[in-house]
Amino acid sequence: MNKQRGTFSEVSLAQDPKRQQRKPKGNKSSISGTEQEIFQVELNLQNPSLNHQGIDKIYDCQGLLPPPEKLTAEVLGIICIVLMATVLKTIVLIPFLEQNNFSPNTRTQKARHCGHCPEEWITYSNSCYYIGKERRTWEESLLACTSKNSSLLSIDNEEEMKFLASILPSSWIGVFRNSSHHPWVTINGLAFKHKIKDSDNAELNCAVLQVNRLKSAQCGSSMIYHCKHKL
Amino acid sequence: MAVFKTTLWRLISGTLGIICLSLMSTLGILLKNSFTKLSIEPAFTPGPNIELQKDSDCCSCQEKWVGYRCNCYFISSEQKTWNESRHLCASQKSSLLQLQNTDELDFMSSSQQFYWIGLSYSEEHTAWLWENGSALSQYLFPSFETFNTKNCIAYNPNGNALDESCEDKNRYICKQQLI
């Protein structure tokens, strides 16, 4: 009777997280390789061998101007190179885009900045979140997030707080006060409007998100921290 | 000799012209086919909003969906029966969680909540099957042999799983795999 269980909640599908994501490999080199070959042909056309000395003399007689046929050939050669490169890029890129369902029609919402979250961070509502596992003091957490080019977790609205509370345990947030006589402020120096429980305790001057609510805690105590970076 | 050279350049120009034309038509066909193919998708889907990122193959997800390791997850706040959960995920162009390893929801490993997953017992195959018809790996849940085959499976991201009446109400997570 050792059934593993303790709660109500939710689930999801899977894949191997360690699997390397597929990237269109080698497209750059293959294109440049082809370009090299075509440029080589072009150079050969532009540098006639010794057998072509006669034509050079004719050019001299015509005031060093190449015949229009050569000029046309050179222009068409360049066009060919450009077209060839475009075709190759298209051949490489189209299956990749299809594989990722990338099309104008998939943009169902107002256009917004793409993810760019570091690996192993999560994205939610135009923000990246680092889900920490280590325990640190409030100040150490602040520095740890700064070193990750982000900020200690901030709560922008009730909806975000509910979401975070559903997946995270207690966590430091970027809100503090200098003493119980001072107001709660964010790490950006803005006044913090939401209610923080236990604010009357003079020893508790840093804020914590704890299952759907905010409470004060001792800044020197060790807690899990999470970082946030807005996109 | 000059006439021969002129003729040679004309020949080269003509050949290059034909090559250019064929390349242009190839390009046109490629682009036409690809955009026709890509445009088959409906203009609005309630599932994840897919946008290619510049620096990775991953894509971003729709509002209120969580993006993690190139997947989008919808974490419900409501409790539903297993069947209701399955249908709600389907309506979002996604499905209930199919696990290939227990650290898929690593970002939620501290959660102490359980979620319906897309696993049910098939009398026909006498096996626990995922929604896509694939069989449950025996290494995923060591206790799966004790599961009541009439029940559905609830899972905690910490790695715990248990069987519960499919009529029980649990929260659920929908997943859409992007790659």
């Epitope: 269980r5 | 029940n151 715990n160």
Partner: antibody, heavy 120, light 107 residues
Framework: EVQLVESGGGLVQPGGSLRLSCAAS????????MNWVRQAPGKGLEWVST????????YYADSVKGRFTISRDNSKDTLYLQMNSLRAEDTAVYYC?????????????WGQGTLVTVSS | DIQMTQSPSSVSASVGDRVTITCRAS??????LAWYQQKSGKAPKLLIY???SLQIGVPSRFSGSGSGTDFTLTISSLQPEDFATYYC?????????FGQGTKLEIK
């Protein structure tokens, strides 16, 4: 305000039966798992049984399995514990407890308890 | 079944003291642990859940820590109303099990 009120306890002979009830109020009863926990006189706490929010899944301690049955009536916001084949060691205060919203394994509200005495 | 062992079984302390009670699980339970306070003749009261989360309405002088097999309940500055019996409980798997209790008495 959450309230849980147990009833149905009393003196019963070994081998006898008793049905405990727990009337719940102040929360959405049908959304939470419910539990019975007991405490023998002068002893510690012992988990007895858990029932899921819909009543479809039940769990029992080995010491009561096959003798006790937990059930619920969500239309009446009431939890029950049917106790059969009672033994002297079942003598205890029986508490009805609500599962915590964060995790059903924690008990955030408890009733005042009802005493069950099994004695001849 | 997972066994929960509390220590000490009883402790004497004075108002204002800092008190620590420990609880050890016979196998790893991650952070699936709760602490309850029970006063004589009363129902238990949830103090801490998920090892370190303070239940709403519980004074902040109570704190919990630990993960895996070793857990601690700390009362930073003992108040007169804190003298009671404290129980830990694992919620990792069925059957849920409680520690034997730690009685906190006035010195």
């Amino acid at each position: 305000e959450v309230q849980l009120v147990e009833s149905g306890g009393g003196l019963v002979q070994p081998g006898g039966s008793l049905r405990l009830s727990c009337a719940a109020s102040g929360f959405t009863f049908s959304s939470y798992a419910m539990n019975w926990v007991r405490q023998a006189p002068g002893k510690g706490l012992e988990w007895v049984s858990t029932i899921s929010n819909s009543g479809g899944t039940t769990y029992y301690a080995d010491s009561v399995k096959g003798r006790f049955t937990i059930s619920r009536d969500n239309s009446k916001d009431t939890l029950y514990l049917q106790m059969n084949s009672l033994r002297a060691e079942d003598t205890a205060v029986y508490y009805c407890a609500k599962a915590h919203y964060y995790a059903r394994g924690y008990f955030d509200y408890w009733g005042q308890g009802t005493l069950v005495t099994v004695s001849s | 079944d997972i066994q929960m062992t509390q220590s000490p079984s009883s402790v004497s302390a004075s108002v204002g003291d800092r008190v620590t009670i420990t609880c050890r699980a016979s196998q790893g339970i991650s952070s699936w642990l709760a602490w309850y306070q029970q006063k004589s003749g009363k129902a238990p009261k949830l103090l801490i859940y998920a090892a370190s989360s303070l239940q709403i309405g519980v004074p902040s002088r109570f704190s919990g820590s630990g993960s895996g097999t070793d857990f601690t309940l700390t009362i930073s500055s003992l108040q007169p109303e804190d003298f009671a019996t404290y129980y830990c409980q694992q919620a990792n798997s069925f059957p849920y099990t409680f520690g034997q209790g730690t009685k906190l008495e006035i010195k």
